[in-house]
Protein backbone atom coordinates (compact mmCIF):
# COMPACT_ATOMS: atom_id res chain seq x y z
CA UNK A 1 0.00 0.00 0.00
CA UNK A 2 1.33 3.45 -0.85
CA UNK A 3 0.60 4.93 2.57
CA UNK A 4 0.34 2.17 5.11
CA UNK A 5 2.44 -0.82 5.95
CA UNK A 6 0.77 -4.11 5.27
CA UNK A 7 1.85 -7.36 6.84
CA UNK A 8 0.34 -10.77 7.06
CA UNK A 9 0.76 -13.01 10.03
CA UNK A 10 -1.00 -16.28 9.91
CA UNK A 11 -4.58 -15.49 9.01
CA UNK A 12 -4.31 -11.86 10.06
CA UNK A 13 -3.76 -9.08 7.62
CA UNK A 14 -2.45 -6.17 9.63
CA UNK A 15 -2.37 -2.67 8.22
CA UNK A 16 -0.30 -0.08 10.04
CA UNK A 17 -1.19 3.50 9.23
CA UNK A 18 0.18 4.98 12.43
CA UNK A 19 1.77 8.41 12.42
CA UNK A 20 0.99 9.27 8.84
CA UNK A 21 -0.59 12.64 9.53
CA UNK A 22 -3.78 11.25 8.12
CA UNK A 23 -6.98 13.26 8.34
CA UNK A 24 -9.15 10.50 6.94
CA UNK A 25 -9.08 6.80 6.24
CA UNK A 26 -6.61 6.06 3.44
CA UNK A 27 -8.26 4.72 0.30
CA UNK A 28 -7.81 1.28 -1.14
CA UNK A 29 -6.82 -0.59 1.96
CA UNK A 30 -6.90 -4.38 1.57
CA UNK A 31 -10.48 -5.56 1.89
CA UNK A 32 -9.44 -8.48 4.05
CA UNK A 33 -7.74 -6.29 6.64
CA UNK A 34 -8.24 -7.72 10.10
CA UNK A 35 -6.17 -5.33 12.19
CA UNK A 36 -6.02 -1.65 11.43
CA UNK A 37 -3.74 0.78 13.18
CA UNK A 38 -4.59 4.44 12.76
CA UNK A 39 -2.95 5.72 15.89
CA UNK A 40 -1.38 9.12 16.18
CA UNK A 41 -2.98 10.72 13.23
CA UNK A 42 -5.05 13.88 12.98
CA UNK A 43 -8.47 12.49 12.34
CA UNK A 44 -10.46 14.82 14.61
CA UNK A 45 -13.66 13.12 13.54
CA UNK A 46 -14.11 9.63 12.27
CA UNK A 47 -17.02 7.59 11.00
CA UNK A 48 -17.05 3.89 11.64
CA UNK A 49 -19.21 3.50 8.57
CA UNK A 50 -16.16 4.09 6.43
CA UNK A 51 -14.86 0.75 7.65
CA UNK A 52 -17.88 -1.28 6.63
CA UNK A 53 -16.19 -2.62 3.50
CA UNK A 54 -13.63 -4.28 5.72
CA UNK A 55 -15.83 -7.12 6.82
CA UNK A 56 -13.04 -9.04 8.53
CA UNK A 57 -11.85 -6.18 10.70
CA UNK A 58 -11.40 -7.42 14.27
CA UNK A 59 -9.19 -4.74 15.79
CA UNK A 60 -9.15 -1.00 15.33
CA UNK A 61 -6.72 1.36 16.95
CA UNK A 62 -7.73 5.00 16.88
CA UNK A 63 -5.78 6.17 19.87
CA UNK A 64 -4.07 9.53 19.90
CA UNK A 65 -5.91 10.83 16.88
CA UNK A 66 -7.23 14.08 18.36
CA UNK A 67 -10.72 12.68 18.03
CA UNK A 68 -13.48 14.92 19.28
CA UNK A 69 -16.25 12.96 17.65
CA UNK A 70 -16.74 9.36 16.63
CA UNK A 71 -19.69 8.73 14.36
CA UNK A 72 -21.28 5.39 14.93
CA UNK A 73 -23.21 4.25 11.94
CA UNK A 74 -23.28 1.07 10.00
CA UNK A 75 -22.15 -2.17 11.53
CA UNK A 76 -18.77 -3.80 11.98
CA UNK A 77 -19.98 -7.27 12.88
CA UNK A 78 -16.71 -8.85 13.93
CA UNK A 79 -14.78 -5.95 15.42
CA UNK A 80 -13.61 -7.14 18.80
CA UNK A 81 -11.14 -4.51 19.96
CA UNK A 82 -11.52 -0.75 19.73
CA UNK A 83 -8.89 1.59 21.13
CA UNK A 84 -10.05 5.16 21.44
CA UNK A 85 -7.64 6.14 24.18
CA UNK A 86 -5.87 9.45 24.39
CA UNK A 87 -8.34 11.42 22.39
CA UNK A 88 -10.61 14.35 23.14
CA UNK A 89 -13.97 12.63 23.34
CA UNK A 90 -16.36 14.36 25.69
CA UNK A 91 -19.06 11.76 25.39
CA UNK A 92 -19.04 8.03 24.95
CA UNK A 93 -20.55 7.01 21.63
CA UNK A 94 -23.31 4.44 21.82
CA UNK A 95 -21.50 1.57 20.19
CA UNK A 96 -23.84 -1.31 20.83
CA UNK A 97 -25.58 -1.43 17.48
CA UNK A 98 -22.49 -0.73 15.46
CA UNK A 99 -20.11 -3.05 17.29
CA UNK A 100 -22.09 -6.03 18.59
CA UNK A 101 -19.02 -8.25 18.88
CA UNK A 102 -16.86 -5.80 20.81
CA UNK A 103 -14.86 -7.49 23.56
CA UNK A 104 -12.35 -4.78 24.44
CA UNK A 105 -13.13 -1.09 24.60
CA UNK A 106 -10.51 1.41 25.63
CA UNK A 107 -11.64 4.97 26.09
CA UNK A 108 -8.97 5.87 28.60
CA UNK A 109 -7.58 9.37 28.77
CA UNK A 110 -10.34 11.22 27.08
CA UNK A 111 -12.53 14.00 28.45
CA UNK A 112 -15.56 12.06 29.55
CA UNK A 113 -17.36 13.77 32.42
CA UNK A 114 -20.34 11.48 32.55
CA UNK A 115 -21.76 8.39 30.94
CA UNK A 116 -25.30 8.25 29.63
CA UNK A 117 -27.86 5.72 30.73
CA UNK A 118 -27.53 2.75 28.45
CA UNK A 119 -24.02 3.73 27.48
CA UNK A 120 -23.04 0.09 27.04
CA UNK A 121 -26.33 -1.28 25.80
CA UNK A 122 -25.77 -3.87 23.12
CA UNK A 123 -22.22 -4.65 24.16
CA UNK A 124 -23.04 -8.05 25.56
CA UNK A 125 -19.69 -9.54 24.56
CA UNK A 126 -17.60 -6.88 26.25
CA UNK A 127 -14.86 -8.34 28.44
CA UNK A 128 -12.63 -5.37 29.08
CA UNK A 129 -13.59 -1.77 29.61
CA UNK A 130 -11.00 0.90 30.20
CA UNK A 131 -12.16 4.32 31.29
CA UNK A 132 -9.08 5.43 33.13
CA UNK A 133 -7.99 9.02 33.14
CA UNK A 134 -11.25 10.73 32.35
CA UNK A 135 -13.26 13.18 34.44
CA UNK A 136 -16.06 10.94 35.59
CA UNK A 137 -17.71 12.02 38.82
CA UNK A 138 -20.53 9.52 38.98
CA UNK A 139 -21.67 6.44 37.13
CA UNK A 140 -25.21 5.77 36.00
CA UNK A 141 -27.08 2.95 37.71
CA UNK A 142 -27.09 -0.21 35.70
CA UNK A 143 -24.08 0.89 33.69
CA UNK A 144 -22.64 -2.60 33.49
CA UNK A 145 -25.86 -4.56 33.35
CA UNK A 146 -25.53 -5.00 29.58
CA UNK A 147 -22.01 -6.41 29.93
CA UNK A 148 -22.29 -9.60 32.01
CA UNK A 149 -19.08 -11.01 30.55
CA UNK A 150 -16.93 -8.16 31.79
CA UNK A 151 -13.62 -9.34 33.19
CA UNK A 152 -11.57 -6.18 33.50
CA UNK A 153 -12.82 -2.77 34.48
CA UNK A 154 -10.69 0.30 34.90
CA UNK A 155 -12.15 3.42 36.36
CA UNK A 156 -8.86 4.62 37.76
CA UNK A 157 -7.80 8.24 37.78
CA UNK A 158 -11.22 9.81 37.53
CA UNK A 159 -13.13 12.03 39.94
CA UNK A 160 -15.52 9.43 41.26
CA UNK A 161 -16.85 10.24 44.70
CA UNK A 162 -19.23 7.32 44.98
CA UNK A 163 -20.13 4.08 43.30
CA UNK A 164 -23.59 2.68 42.57
CA UNK A 165 -24.28 -0.10 45.05
CA UNK A 166 -25.14 -2.60 42.35
CA UNK A 167 -22.43 -1.64 39.90
CA UNK A 168 -20.84 -5.10 39.92
CA UNK A 169 -24.04 -7.10 40.13
CA UNK A 170 -24.01 -10.00 37.74
CA UNK A 171 -20.36 -9.60 36.80
CA UNK A 172 -19.38 -13.09 37.76
CA UNK A 173 -16.32 -13.06 35.55
CA UNK A 174 -14.86 -9.83 36.84
CA UNK A 175 -11.30 -10.46 37.89
CA UNK A 176 -9.68 -7.05 37.77
CA UNK A 177 -11.09 -3.83 39.14
CA UNK A 178 -9.09 -0.63 39.04
CA UNK A 179 -10.51 2.14 41.17
CA UNK A 180 -7.32 3.78 42.32
CA UNK A 181 -6.80 7.52 42.33
CA UNK A 182 -10.39 8.68 42.58
CA UNK A 183 -12.27 10.58 45.27
CA UNK A 184 -14.03 7.61 46.79
CA UNK A 185 -14.65 7.81 50.51
CA UNK A 186 -16.65 4.64 51.07
CA UNK A 187 -17.85 1.46 49.43
CA UNK A 188 -21.54 0.57 49.52
CA UNK A 189 -22.43 -2.47 51.57
CA UNK A 190 -22.50 -5.57 49.46
CA UNK A 191 -20.75 -3.80 46.61
CA UNK A 192 -18.39 -6.66 45.86
CA UNK A 193 -20.98 -9.36 46.08
CA UNK A 194 -19.92 -12.87 46.99
CA UNK A 195 -17.37 -13.45 44.29
CA UNK A 196 -13.70 -13.32 44.91
CA UNK A 197 -12.12 -10.46 43.04
CA UNK A 198 -8.57 -11.53 42.21
CA UNK A 199 -7.16 -8.11 41.48
CA UNK A 200 -8.35 -4.94 43.07
CA UNK A 201 -6.64 -1.56 42.96
CA UNK A 202 -8.14 0.77 45.51
CA UNK A 203 -5.37 3.02 46.74
CA UNK A 204 -5.25 6.76 46.30
CA UNK A 205 -8.79 7.40 47.51
CA UNK A 206 -9.77 9.45 50.56
CA UNK A 207 -11.41 6.60 52.44
CA UNK A 208 -13.43 7.86 55.36
CA UNK A 209 -13.03 5.51 58.28
CA UNK A 210 -16.22 5.56 60.23
CA UNK A 211 -18.96 3.05 60.87
CA UNK A 212 -19.97 3.13 57.23
CA UNK A 213 -16.63 1.67 56.21
CA UNK A 214 -17.00 -1.57 58.16
CA UNK A 215 -18.27 -3.59 55.23
CA UNK A 216 -15.31 -2.47 53.16
CA UNK A 217 -12.97 -3.24 56.02
CA UNK A 218 -14.23 -6.78 56.22
CA UNK A 219 -13.98 -7.18 52.49
CA UNK A 220 -10.40 -6.01 52.62
CA UNK A 221 -9.67 -8.51 55.31
CA UNK A 222 -11.22 -11.36 53.37
CA UNK A 223 -9.46 -10.30 50.21
CA UNK A 224 -6.23 -8.93 51.56
CA UNK A 225 -4.17 -10.90 49.12
CA UNK A 226 -6.10 -9.54 46.17
CA UNK A 227 -5.50 -5.86 46.78
CA UNK A 228 -2.64 -4.36 44.85
CA UNK A 229 -0.95 -1.10 44.18
CA UNK A 230 -0.38 -0.15 40.63
CA UNK A 231 3.01 1.15 39.74
CA UNK A 232 4.11 2.11 36.35
CA UNK A 233 7.19 0.57 34.96
CA UNK A 234 7.13 -2.42 37.19
CA UNK A 235 6.81 -5.88 35.82
CA UNK A 236 3.61 -7.43 36.83
CA UNK A 237 5.53 -10.37 38.10
CA UNK A 238 7.08 -8.09 40.63
CA UNK A 239 3.82 -6.91 42.02
CA UNK A 240 2.77 -7.96 45.41
CA UNK A 241 -0.49 -7.49 47.13
CA UNK A 242 -0.71 -4.66 49.60
CA UNK A 243 -3.93 -4.33 51.47
CA UNK A 244 -2.33 -1.62 53.58
CA UNK A 245 -2.37 0.60 50.52
CA UNK A 246 -6.03 1.29 51.22
CA UNK A 247 -5.79 3.96 53.87
CA UNK A 248 -8.06 6.05 55.98
CA UNK A 249 -7.92 9.64 54.87
CA UNK A 250 -9.11 10.84 58.24
CA UNK A 251 -6.71 8.86 60.37
CA UNK A 252 -3.21 9.59 59.33
CA UNK A 253 -3.17 7.00 56.59
CA UNK A 254 -4.16 4.19 58.87
CA UNK A 255 -4.96 1.05 56.87
CA UNK A 256 -8.68 0.63 56.43
CA UNK A 257 -8.47 -3.08 57.01
CA UNK A 258 -7.27 -2.42 60.53
CA UNK A 259 -9.83 0.19 61.37
CA UNK A 260 -11.19 -0.88 64.75
CA UNK A 261 -14.70 0.41 64.34
CA UNK A 262 -15.03 0.93 68.01
CA UNK A 263 -18.34 2.32 69.05
CA UNK A 264 -20.07 1.26 65.86
CA UNK A 265 -23.43 -0.47 66.04
CA UNK A 266 -23.14 -4.16 66.49
CA UNK A 267 -25.45 -7.03 65.97
CA UNK A 268 -26.02 -8.78 69.20
CA UNK A 269 -22.75 -8.79 71.03
CA UNK A 270 -20.72 -8.34 67.95
CA UNK A 271 -20.53 -8.09 64.28
CA UNK A 272 -21.46 -5.30 62.04
CA UNK A 273 -25.07 -4.69 61.47
CA UNK A 274 -24.66 -5.30 57.80
CA UNK A 275 -25.09 -8.98 57.71
CA UNK A 276 -26.52 -11.15 55.12
CA UNK A 277 -29.24 -8.74 54.47
CA UNK A 278 -26.70 -6.83 52.53
CA UNK A 279 -25.36 -9.67 50.54
CA UNK A 280 -25.98 -8.77 46.98
CA UNK A 281 -27.44 -11.62 45.06
CA UNK A 282 -24.98 -14.04 46.46
CA UNK A 283 -24.30 -16.96 44.30
CA UNK A 284 -24.84 -19.37 47.03
CA UNK A 285 -23.84 -22.19 44.86
CA UNK A 286 -20.64 -20.48 44.37
CA UNK A 287 -20.59 -21.50 40.80
CA UNK A 288 -18.81 -18.40 40.03
CA UNK A 289 -16.95 -17.43 43.03
CA UNK A 290 -13.54 -16.38 42.10
CA UNK A 291 -10.83 -17.14 44.40
CA UNK A 292 -7.29 -16.79 43.82
CA UNK A 293 -5.32 -19.36 45.54
CA UNK A 294 -1.96 -20.59 45.20
CA UNK A 295 -2.30 -24.15 45.10
CA UNK A 296 0.15 -25.58 47.32
CA UNK A 297 -1.65 -27.62 49.80
CA UNK A 298 -0.63 -26.92 53.28
CA UNK A 299 -0.98 -29.01 56.24
CA UNK A 300 -4.52 -29.09 57.21
CA UNK A 301 -3.97 -26.86 60.04
CA UNK A 302 -1.56 -24.75 58.35
CA UNK A 303 -0.39 -23.57 61.61
CA UNK A 304 -2.99 -21.28 62.78
CA UNK A 305 -2.22 -17.98 61.47
CA UNK A 306 -0.27 -16.19 63.96
CA UNK A 307 -2.67 -13.54 63.57
CA UNK A 308 -4.88 -15.68 65.48
CA UNK A 309 -7.36 -13.04 65.42
CA UNK A 310 -5.61 -11.65 62.64
CA UNK A 311 -7.25 -8.37 62.81
CA UNK A 312 -6.14 -7.20 66.04
CA UNK A 313 -6.11 -3.52 65.72
CA UNK A 314 -2.77 -3.27 67.32
CA UNK A 315 -1.15 -5.92 65.27
CA UNK A 316 0.75 -4.52 62.41
CA UNK A 317 2.07 -7.56 60.80
CA UNK A 318 0.11 -6.98 57.69
CA UNK A 319 1.19 -3.49 57.47
CA UNK A 320 4.70 -4.29 58.16
CA UNK A 321 4.59 -6.91 55.58
CA UNK A 322 3.32 -4.62 53.02
CA UNK A 323 4.83 -1.64 51.49
CA UNK A 324 3.61 1.32 53.28
CA UNK A 325 3.87 3.86 50.61
CA UNK A 326 1.53 2.95 47.93
CA UNK A 327 1.14 5.73 45.61
CA UNK A 328 1.64 4.17 42.30
CA UNK A 329 3.19 6.16 39.66
CA UNK A 330 1.23 6.94 36.64
CA UNK A 331 0.24 3.93 34.78
CA UNK A 332 1.48 3.79 31.33
CA UNK A 333 -1.41 3.82 29.06
CA UNK A 334 -0.32 1.02 26.97
CA UNK A 335 1.58 -1.06 29.24
CA UNK A 336 0.62 -4.49 28.38
CA UNK A 337 0.96 -6.11 31.60
CA UNK A 338 -0.91 -9.27 31.43
CA UNK A 339 -2.96 -10.35 34.29
CA UNK A 340 -3.22 -13.88 35.19
CA UNK A 341 -6.57 -15.07 34.18
CA UNK A 342 -9.06 -15.74 36.76
CA UNK A 343 -9.00 -19.22 37.98
CA UNK A 344 -11.74 -21.22 36.61
CA UNK A 345 -13.22 -24.34 37.94
CA UNK A 346 -10.99 -27.25 37.91
CA UNK A 347 -8.42 -24.70 37.49
CA UNK A 348 -9.00 -24.64 33.92
CA UNK A 349 -7.88 -21.18 33.55
CA UNK A 350 -9.52 -19.74 30.62
CA UNK A 351 -7.25 -16.91 30.61
CA UNK A 352 -8.35 -15.99 27.31
CA UNK A 353 -5.05 -15.33 26.05
CA UNK A 354 -6.25 -12.71 23.91
CA UNK A 355 -3.31 -10.80 23.14
CA UNK A 356 -4.48 -7.85 21.51
CA UNK A 357 -3.14 -8.06 18.14
CA UNK A 358 -3.02 -4.49 18.57
CA UNK A 359 0.60 -4.12 18.65
CA UNK A 360 1.62 -1.66 21.15
CA UNK A 361 2.50 1.22 19.10
CA UNK A 362 4.98 3.60 20.19
CA UNK A 363 3.06 6.72 20.36
CA UNK A 364 3.82 10.09 21.48
CA UNK A 365 3.62 8.64 24.85
CA UNK A 366 5.74 5.60 24.91
CA UNK A 367 3.89 2.82 26.41
CA UNK A 368 5.44 -0.31 27.55
CA UNK A 369 5.07 -3.01 25.11
CA UNK A 370 2.87 -5.75 26.27
CA UNK A 371 4.81 -8.17 28.14
CA UNK A 372 3.95 -11.72 28.03
CA UNK A 373 1.25 -12.64 30.30
CA UNK A 374 2.62 -13.02 33.63
CA UNK A 375 3.08 -16.50 34.71
CA UNK A 376 0.16 -17.67 36.51
CA UNK A 377 0.32 -20.14 39.24
CA UNK A 378 -0.82 -23.45 38.16
CA UNK A 379 -4.42 -23.76 38.83
CA UNK A 380 -5.24 -26.11 41.49
CA UNK A 381 -7.25 -28.85 40.04
CA UNK A 382 -9.89 -28.67 42.59
CA UNK A 383 -10.43 -25.08 42.78
CA UNK A 384 -13.16 -23.59 40.93
CA UNK A 385 -13.73 -20.04 40.77
CA UNK A 386 -17.23 -19.32 40.82
CA UNK A 387 -17.18 -18.75 37.26
CA UNK A 388 -14.21 -16.82 36.78
CA UNK A 389 -12.86 -17.33 33.47
CA UNK A 390 -9.51 -15.92 33.53
CA UNK A 391 -9.74 -12.77 31.81
CA UNK A 392 -6.98 -11.68 29.68
CA UNK A 393 -4.20 -10.52 31.69
CA UNK A 394 -3.53 -7.49 29.87
CA UNK A 395 -2.45 -4.26 31.17
CA UNK A 396 -5.16 -1.90 31.47
CA UNK A 397 -5.39 -0.12 28.27
CA UNK A 398 -4.30 3.30 27.89
CA UNK A 399 -3.00 3.88 31.18
CA UNK A 400 -0.82 6.78 30.83
CA UNK A 401 2.10 5.82 28.80
CA UNK A 402 4.59 4.32 30.97
CA UNK A 403 7.93 2.99 30.14
CA UNK A 404 7.87 -0.24 28.44
CA UNK A 405 7.74 -2.12 31.66
CA UNK A 406 4.57 -3.90 31.30
CA UNK A 407 4.03 -4.84 34.79
CA UNK A 408 3.26 -2.31 37.37
CA UNK A 409 5.99 -1.56 39.67
CA UNK A 410 5.67 -3.00 43.02
CA UNK A 411 4.19 -0.68 45.44
CA UNK A 412 6.50 1.87 46.71
CA UNK A 413 7.68 -0.58 49.16
CA UNK A 414 7.24 -4.02 47.93
CA UNK A 415 5.55 -5.67 50.70
CA UNK A 416 6.76 -9.06 51.36
CA UNK A 417 3.98 -11.36 50.91
CA UNK A 418 3.41 -12.25 54.43
CA UNK A 419 2.43 -15.74 54.40
CA UNK A 420 2.39 -16.02 58.02
CA UNK A 421 -0.58 -14.40 59.52
CA UNK A 422 0.23 -11.82 61.94
CA UNK A 423 -0.58 -12.73 65.43
CA UNK A 424 -3.80 -11.38 66.62
CA UNK A 425 -5.42 -11.14 69.89
CA UNK A 426 -5.17 -14.82 70.05
CA UNK A 427 -2.00 -15.77 68.44
CA UNK A 428 -2.58 -18.68 66.26
CA UNK A 429 0.32 -20.53 65.08
CA UNK A 430 1.54 -18.27 62.43
CA UNK A 431 1.49 -20.21 59.35
CA UNK A 432 4.54 -19.14 57.74
CA UNK A 433 4.19 -19.33 54.15
CA UNK A 434 2.43 -22.55 53.89
CA UNK A 435 4.46 -25.21 52.39
CA UNK A 436 3.22 -26.20 49.08
CA UNK A 437 1.38 -29.33 49.37
CA UNK A 438 0.87 -31.90 46.77
CA UNK A 439 -2.64 -30.96 46.20
CA UNK A 440 -2.58 -28.63 43.34
CA UNK A 441 -4.79 -25.79 43.79
CA UNK A 442 -4.66 -22.62 42.10
CA UNK A 443 -1.33 -21.35 42.85
CA UNK A 444 -1.76 -17.76 42.96
CA UNK A 445 1.21 -16.80 44.81
CA UNK A 446 4.38 -18.43 44.03
CA UNK A 447 4.85 -19.48 47.53
CA UNK A 448 1.44 -20.28 48.60
CA UNK A 449 -0.62 -22.67 46.72
CA UNK A 450 -4.00 -22.93 47.99
CA UNK A 451 -5.08 -26.40 47.99
CA UNK A 452 -8.42 -25.20 47.21
CA UNK A 453 -10.31 -27.96 45.86
CA UNK A 454 -12.60 -25.68 44.23
CA UNK A 455 -11.65 -22.42 45.48
CA UNK A 456 -12.06 -19.96 42.89
CA UNK A 457 -8.81 -18.47 42.41
CA UNK A 458 -8.82 -15.17 40.86
CA UNK A 459 -7.21 -15.29 37.59
CA UNK A 460 -4.36 -13.31 38.60
CA UNK A 461 -4.89 -12.64 42.12
CA UNK A 462 -2.32 -14.90 43.39
CA UNK A 463 -0.07 -14.83 40.58
CA UNK A 464 2.76 -14.61 42.81
CA UNK A 465 4.30 -17.57 41.38
CA UNK A 466 6.98 -16.48 39.16
CA UNK A 467 6.88 -19.52 37.09
CA UNK A 468 4.20 -19.18 34.55
CA UNK A 469 1.44 -21.50 35.07
CA UNK A 470 0.82 -23.24 31.88
CA UNK A 471 -2.84 -23.09 32.30
CA UNK A 472 -2.93 -19.59 33.35
CA UNK A 473 -0.51 -18.46 30.87
CA UNK A 474 -2.28 -20.13 28.14
CA UNK A 475 -5.39 -18.47 29.16
CA UNK A 476 -4.01 -15.10 29.78
CA UNK A 477 -4.81 -12.32 27.56
CA UNK A 478 -2.39 -9.67 27.15
CA UNK A 479 -4.04 -6.42 26.83
CA UNK A 480 -2.01 -3.51 25.87
CA UNK A 481 -2.53 -0.55 27.99
CA UNK A 482 -4.46 -2.28 30.57
CA UNK A 483 -4.64 -0.12 33.54
CA UNK A 484 -2.14 -2.63 34.08
CA UNK A 485 -3.43 -4.53 36.72
CA UNK A 486 0.01 -5.75 36.74
CA UNK A 487 0.42 -9.32 36.41
CA UNK A 488 -0.10 -9.31 39.93
CA UNK A 489 1.78 -12.06 41.30
CA UNK A 490 -0.37 -12.14 44.23
CA UNK A 491 2.07 -12.48 46.90
CA UNK A 492 -0.03 -13.30 49.79
CA UNK A 493 0.64 -10.39 51.82
CA UNK A 494 -2.26 -9.24 53.64
CA UNK A 495 -3.63 -11.99 55.60
CA UNK A 496 -6.60 -10.00 56.26
CA UNK A 497 -9.91 -11.21 55.43
CA UNK A 498 -12.27 -8.66 54.36
CA UNK A 499 -15.67 -9.78 54.72
CA UNK A 500 -18.18 -8.09 52.77
CA UNK A 501 -21.60 -8.53 53.97
CA UNK A 502 -20.28 -11.09 56.21
CA UNK A 503 -22.78 -11.36 58.88
CA UNK A 504 -20.20 -12.80 61.08
CA UNK A 505 -17.83 -10.05 60.90
CA UNK A 506 -17.56 -8.17 64.05
CA UNK A 507 -17.36 -4.48 63.56
CA UNK A 508 -14.41 -4.28 65.78
CA UNK A 509 -11.87 -5.91 63.71
CA UNK A 510 -9.53 -4.33 65.99
CA UNK A 511 -9.71 -7.08 68.30
CA UNK A 512 -10.42 -10.32 66.72
CA UNK A 513 -10.99 -12.63 69.52
CA UNK A 514 -10.65 -16.25 69.05
CA UNK A 515 -13.88 -17.88 68.17
Amino acid sequence: HPICEVSKVASHLEVNCDKRNLTALPPDLPKDTTILHLSENLLYTFSLATLMPYTRLTQLNLDRCELTKLQVDGTLPVLGTLDLSHNQLQSLPLLGQTLPALTVLDVSFNRLTSLPLGALRGLGELQELYLKGNELKTLPPGLLTPTPKLEKLSLANNNLTELPAGLLNGLENLDTLLLQENSLYTIPKGFFGSHLLPFAFLHGNPWLCNCEILYFRRWLQDNAENVYVWKQGVDVKAMTSNVASVQCDNSDKFPVYKYPGKGCPTLGDEGDTDLYDYYPEEDTEGDKVRATRTVVKFPTKAHTTPWGLFYSWSTASLDSQMPSSLHPTQESTKEQTTFPPRWTPNFTLHMESITFSKTPKSTTEPTPSPTTSEPVPEPAPNMTTLEPTPSPTTPEPTSEPAPSPTTPEPTSEPAPSPTTPEPTSEPAPSPTTPEPTPIPTIATSPTILVSATSLITPKSTFLTTTKPVSLLESTKKTIPELDQPPKLRGVLQGHLESSRNDPFLHPDFCCLLPL
Partner: nanobody, 123 residues
Protein backbone atom coordinates in the same frame (compact mmCIF):
# COMPACT_ATOMS: atom_id res chain seq x y z
CA UNK B 1 -10.58 -21.56 73.17
CA UNK B 2 -13.13 -21.73 70.43
CA UNK B 3 -15.04 -24.94 70.03
CA UNK B 4 -16.48 -25.90 66.67
CA UNK B 5 -19.07 -28.64 66.76
CA UNK B 6 -20.29 -30.22 63.53
CA UNK B 7 -23.57 -32.05 63.10
CA UNK B 8 -25.82 -33.29 60.35
CA UNK B 9 -23.66 -36.03 58.93
CA UNK B 10 -24.88 -39.51 58.30
CA UNK B 11 -25.64 -42.16 55.72
CA UNK B 12 -27.40 -41.10 52.56
CA UNK B 13 -28.04 -42.69 49.22
CA UNK B 14 -26.41 -41.43 46.07
CA UNK B 15 -28.31 -38.46 44.74
CA UNK B 16 -29.47 -37.50 48.20
CA UNK B 17 -28.86 -34.38 50.23
CA UNK B 18 -27.47 -33.45 53.62
CA UNK B 19 -27.24 -30.23 55.57
CA UNK B 20 -24.28 -29.95 57.88
CA UNK B 21 -24.12 -27.43 60.67
CA UNK B 22 -21.18 -26.07 62.61
CA UNK B 23 -21.80 -24.26 65.86
CA UNK B 24 -19.10 -22.06 67.33
CA UNK B 25 -18.74 -21.44 71.02
CA UNK B 26 -17.70 -17.84 70.76
CA UNK B 27 -19.53 -14.77 69.71
CA UNK B 28 -16.51 -13.56 67.80
CA UNK B 29 -17.64 -15.85 65.04
CA UNK B 30 -18.15 -12.93 62.67
CA UNK B 31 -14.47 -12.14 62.75
CA UNK B 32 -13.53 -15.36 61.04
CA UNK B 33 -13.55 -16.86 57.65
CA UNK B 34 -15.56 -20.02 58.15
CA UNK B 35 -15.77 -23.05 56.01
CA UNK B 36 -15.48 -26.75 55.48
CA UNK B 37 -12.84 -29.20 54.43
CA UNK B 38 -13.09 -32.94 54.14
CA UNK B 39 -10.91 -35.98 54.32
CA UNK B 40 -11.73 -39.32 52.80
CA UNK B 41 -10.05 -42.52 53.96
CA UNK B 42 -6.53 -42.74 52.63
CA UNK B 43 -6.73 -39.34 51.03
CA UNK B 44 -5.47 -35.89 51.86
CA UNK B 45 -7.61 -33.15 53.20
CA UNK B 46 -9.26 -30.94 50.66
CA UNK B 47 -11.03 -27.63 50.98
CA UNK B 48 -14.71 -27.77 50.22
CA UNK B 49 -16.01 -24.25 50.69
CA UNK B 50 -15.45 -21.08 52.67
CA UNK B 51 -17.38 -17.94 53.45
CA UNK B 52 -15.68 -14.74 54.46
CA UNK B 53 -16.66 -12.04 56.83
CA UNK B 54 -17.83 -9.89 53.98
CA UNK B 55 -19.73 -12.64 52.28
CA UNK B 56 -17.09 -13.67 49.79
CA UNK B 57 -17.64 -17.33 48.98
CA UNK B 58 -15.39 -20.00 47.57
CA UNK B 59 -16.31 -23.47 46.42
CA UNK B 60 -14.27 -26.46 45.42
CA UNK B 61 -14.56 -27.55 41.85
CA UNK B 62 -15.38 -31.07 42.81
CA UNK B 63 -18.60 -29.93 44.44
CA UNK B 64 -19.35 -26.87 42.43
CA UNK B 65 -23.03 -26.42 41.81
CA UNK B 66 -23.96 -29.02 44.40
CA UNK B 67 -23.17 -27.20 47.59
CA UNK B 68 -24.15 -23.98 49.27
CA UNK B 69 -22.49 -22.41 52.27
CA UNK B 70 -24.17 -19.89 54.51
CA UNK B 71 -23.64 -18.48 57.92
CA UNK B 72 -25.77 -17.06 60.64
CA UNK B 73 -23.67 -14.78 62.77
CA UNK B 74 -26.45 -14.29 65.25
CA UNK B 75 -26.38 -18.01 65.93
CA UNK B 76 -22.63 -18.41 65.50
CA UNK B 77 -23.34 -21.13 63.03
CA UNK B 78 -22.20 -21.97 59.52
CA UNK B 79 -24.12 -24.35 57.28
CA UNK B 80 -23.21 -26.55 54.38
CA UNK B 81 -26.01 -27.74 52.14
CA UNK B 82 -24.91 -30.64 49.94
CA UNK B 83 -27.06 -31.95 47.11
CA UNK B 84 -26.73 -34.66 44.48
CA UNK B 85 -24.26 -36.52 46.63
CA UNK B 86 -22.15 -39.29 45.14
CA UNK B 87 -20.08 -42.03 46.73
CA UNK B 88 -17.01 -39.90 46.01
CA UNK B 89 -18.32 -37.42 48.55
CA UNK B 90 -17.94 -39.96 51.33
CA UNK B 91 -15.57 -38.46 53.90
CA UNK B 92 -15.33 -36.87 57.29
CA UNK B 93 -16.37 -33.24 56.94
CA UNK B 94 -14.70 -30.74 59.21
CA UNK B 95 -15.68 -27.21 60.05
CA UNK B 96 -12.85 -24.72 60.36
CA UNK B 97 -12.28 -21.09 61.20
CA UNK B 98 -9.50 -18.77 60.11
CA UNK B 99 -8.80 -15.25 61.19
CA UNK B 100 -6.84 -14.71 58.01
CA UNK B 101 -7.94 -14.14 54.46
CA UNK B 102 -10.01 -16.30 52.20
CA UNK B 103 -6.86 -17.48 50.53
CA UNK B 104 -5.35 -18.45 53.82
CA UNK B 105 -8.37 -20.49 54.66
CA UNK B 106 -8.17 -22.25 51.36
CA UNK B 107 -4.56 -23.00 52.11
CA UNK B 108 -5.84 -24.68 55.23
CA UNK B 109 -4.35 -22.14 57.55
CA UNK B 110 -6.96 -22.53 60.24
CA UNK B 111 -7.13 -21.16 63.72
CA UNK B 112 -9.69 -23.71 64.76
CA UNK B 113 -11.26 -26.85 63.42
CA UNK B 114 -13.91 -29.20 64.66
CA UNK B 115 -13.79 -32.93 65.27
CA UNK B 116 -15.65 -33.69 62.08
CA UNK B 117 -18.86 -35.41 61.11
CA UNK B 118 -18.98 -38.53 58.97
CA UNK B 119 -20.81 -38.38 55.66
CA UNK B 120 -21.31 -41.69 53.90
CA UNK B 121 -22.92 -41.88 50.50
CA UNK B 122 -23.98 -45.33 49.41
CA UNK B 123 -24.52 -46.33 45.84
Amino acid sequence: EVQLVESGGGLVQAGGSLRLSCAASRRTFSNYVMGWFRQAPGKERESVTAIGRSGTILYADSMKGRITISRDNAKNTVYLQMNSLTPDDTAVYYCAASSGSMQQFWRMEYDYEGQGTQVTVSS
